[in-house]
Amino acid sequence: QFLKEGQLAAGTCEIVTLDRDSSQPRIEERSQTARCACRKGQIAGTTRARPACVDARIIKTKQWCDMLPCLEGEGCDLLINRSGWTCTQPGGRIKTTTVS
């Protein structure tokens, strides 16, 4: 089966990430878009800081930490209004990812 330009093969993901520095040195803001071809009931998301297919119910409920989006050794917390999540590294540095 041939794919048109821009199409994804089944079970593949691609991600577009926009990083921007914050005025606070310990905080990194991150905006990303993932496209995945997933199994039924799943949708593009982020797991262990990689684009991945995640259960669609996570997206519906905005329980972003249930994707396990942070790297091992980090802690995950929801942003206010469930607009995204933060990953806190052991040293205290915080990575913020917003979902739009």
Epitope: T47, E74, G75
Partner: antibody, heavy 122, light 108 residues
Framework: QSLEESGGRLVTPGTPLTLTCTAS????????MGWVRQAPGEGLEWIGI?????STYYASWAKGRFTISKTSTTVDLKMTSLTTEDTATYFC???????????????????WGQGTLVTVSS | ELDMTQTPPSLSASVGETVRIRCLAS??????ISWYQQKPGKPPTLLIY???NLESGVPPRFSGSGSGTDYTLTIGGVQAEDAATYYC??????????FGAGTNVEIK
């Protein structure tokens, strides 16, 4: 990184019992946690899972009698209406998600406790 | 509810032989299977996840294969220390997860 179960003991049928799994060296906010049991001389049996958010899912046979909850460092398994069939070693396990080459995510029970023995006998 | 049929229940092999353990799922689990080794009195340890991904620190003689409903754990050149019971775990954490009944591997 380690897991340690506690609370297992000899109880009489019908007695409620709560087991506790204490996690060290990692954040429960960044993993799923599951409970598995093993009757003497038998195989492994899945009980249920708790997600980072605190949402829970159970094996069909465990619904209603078993409840999983957590704090920042512990995961509890509350058991009610115990019968002799519930005699087993109860394990807690950390469930990570491994991402394959194609973005598909797979469960990995990558860290287990040593287990705690629950004996139900009259 | 998902059912995982594991065969054989037990087997005996000589050092150096290739051992194969099969798990058959009652529905397509899209490579959602992991394999565990358990020795008496100990908790299980992870060998393979995602059908074919070798867990870090596991000897390369262990391998996994399969797709759809049919999956196999292979121990190529089995060693004395591989005597244990092996379990498959099929399904996904957001749906149904089930262990196979286990395969007891004895080394002659």
């Amino acid at each position: 990184q380690s897991l340690e179960e506690s609370g297992g003991r000899l109880v009489t049928p019908g007695t409620p019992l709560t087991l506790t799994c204490t996690a060290s060296g990692f954040s429960l906010s960044n993993y799923y946690m599951g409970w598995v049991r093993q009757a003497p001389g038998e195989g492994l049996e899945w009980i249920g899972i708790i997600y980072a958010s605190g949402s829970t899912y159970y094996a069909s046979w465990a619904k209603g009698r078993f409840t999983i909850s957590k704090t920042s460092t512990t995961v509890d398994l509350k058991m009610t209406s115990l019968t002799t069939e519930d005699t087993a070693t109860y394990f807690c396990a950390r469930i990570d998600i491994g991402v394959g080459d194609y973005g598909w995510a797979y469960d990995r029970l990558d860290l287990w406790g040593q287990g705690t023995l629950v004996t139900v006998s009259s | 509810e998902l059912d995982m049929t594991q065969t054989p229940p037990s087997l005996s092999a000589s050092v150096g032989e290739t051992v194969r353990i099969r798990c058959l799922a009652s529905e397509d689990i899209y490579s959602g299977i992991s394999w565990y080794q358990q020795k008496p009195g100990k908790p299980p340890t992870l060998l393979i996840y995602g059908a074919s991904n070798l867990e870090s620190g596991v000897p390369p003689r262990f391998s996994g294969s399969g797709s759809g409903t049919d999956y196999t754990l292979t121990i190529g050149g089995v060693q004395a220390e591989d005597a244990a019971t092996y379990y498959c775990l099929g399904g996904y954490s957001y749906s149904s997860i089930t262990f196979g009944a286990g395969t007891n591997v004895e080394i002659k």
